[in-house]
């Protein structure tokens, strides 16, 4: 089989601070040295890019400075964290992995992680 399998959790609940973390694991058919990981959000059949990072195997995963994502990599596993989430951001977050180099190129699409975000209740004013 030439397809690359990507595994990710089915459901994740964001913290009260709007932070959600999940692991994206891929079964590499070859020895990739350059990998691109993209987080996509799917809502009502529309797909948008949340963040993306290209890394060399053995090096750290680096997202752009203004990205809402951070991450670390270890072998064929990527630990992804998405920050600044609000209730309206609840949705399906798909992990996409591309083995860019060396040839052949492989594409792997995960089934998606449903991230639930609940906005925290505002603190009541203190009478003290």
């Amino acid at each position: 089989c030439k397809a690359m399998h990507v595994a990710q959790p089915a459901v994740v609940l964001a913290s009260s601070r709007g932070i959600a973390s999940f692991v994206c694991e891929y079964a590499s058919p070859g020895k990739a040295t350059e990998v691109r990981v993209t987080v996509l959000r799917q809502a009502d059949s529309q797909v948008t890019e949340v963040c993306a990072a290209t890394y060399m195997m053995g090096n750290e995963l680096t997202f752009l400075d203004d990205s809402i994502c951070t991450g670390t990599s270890s072998g064929n596993q990527v630990n992804l964290t998405i920050q600044g989430l609000r209730a309206m951001d609840t949705g399906l977050y798909i992990c996409k992995v591309e083995l860019m180099y060396p040839p052949p190129y492989y594409l792997g699409i995960g089934n998606g992680t449903q991230i639930y975000v609940i906005d925290p209740e505002p603190c009541p004013d203190s009478d003290f």
């Epitope: 030439k2 058919p29 993209t38 993306a52 190129y105 492989y106 594409l107 699409i109």
Partner: antibody, heavy 118, light 108 residues
């Protein structure tokens, strides 16, 4: 409007060269991989070449390897195909296509005709 | 290289009838990586189905895809006059990206 527009096709003699261009508009060009696909008269679709987001990685069909070079300029939202040592069998309509976020070629240009004949 | 073989080469169908097109891969293709395209004379191909069964934006629900492994199917439930065209399957899970040779759906 989200679109791709190819240009640069024409008639060229065997052994000659041609440079195709593809102008992208209406989307963040650097967030997508890009491809060239060709179609010989009356024939099916044949993938020609691929280029990664930043242009660092490039792949080619065996039939054009060593003769064609793909490149992109993200600042200009443009994709290119430099075709050298052209042969009669390279005669085709050449399409640029966007590699969609989930992988399929979700946006195509209108195509540009390349004819290689003496 | 994954070779895709489409059948039949030509399908003659009357408007309103059902059309079933087949695409067979030389080795297993993950269902997430199989697409179908429609091409009319003088036009560029248009994405119909991706991920074996998901309809692209704006594609009517009379088009449906199914299958897994090495066998995939495109079904057009009720052929409209504008559906007479050539249809291609494609795998995009690994390089080289490959297309089937196409199935022409013509008016009977």
């Amino acid at each position: 409007e989200v679109q791709l527009v190819e240009s640069g096709g024409g008639l060229v003699k065997p052994g000659g060269s041609l440079r195709l261009s593809c102008a992208a508009s209406g989307f963040t060009f650097s967030s997508y991989t890009m491809h060239w696909v060709r179609q010989a008269p009356g024939k099916g679709l044949e993938w020609v070449s691929f280029i990664s987001y930043d242009g660092n990685q490039k792949y080619y069909a065996d039939s054009v390897k060593g003769r064609f070079t793909i490149s992109r300029d993200n600042a200009k939202n443009s994709l290119y195909l430099q075709m050298n040592s052209l042969r009669a069998e390279d005669t085709a309509v050449y399409y640029c296509a966007r590699g969609g976020l989930l992988g399929p070629f979700d946006l195509w240009g209108q195509g540009t005709m390349v004819t290689v004949s003496s | 290289e994954i070779v895709l073989t489409q059948s039949p080469g030509t399908l003659s169908v009357s408007p309103g009838e059902r059309a079933t097109l087949s695409c067979r891969a030389s080795q297993s293709v993950g269902s997430s990586y199989l697409a179908w395209y429609q091409q009319k004379p003088g036009q560029a191909p248009r994405l119909l189905i991706y991920g074996a069964f998901s309809r692209a934006t704006g594609i009517p629900d009379r088009f449906s895809g199914s299958g897994s492994g090495t066998d995939f199917t495109l079904t057009i439930s009720r052929l409209e006059p504008e559906d007479f065209a050539v249809y291609y399957c494609q795998q995009y899970g690994s390089s080289p990206w490959t297309f089937g040779q196409g199935t022409k759906v013509e008016i009977k």
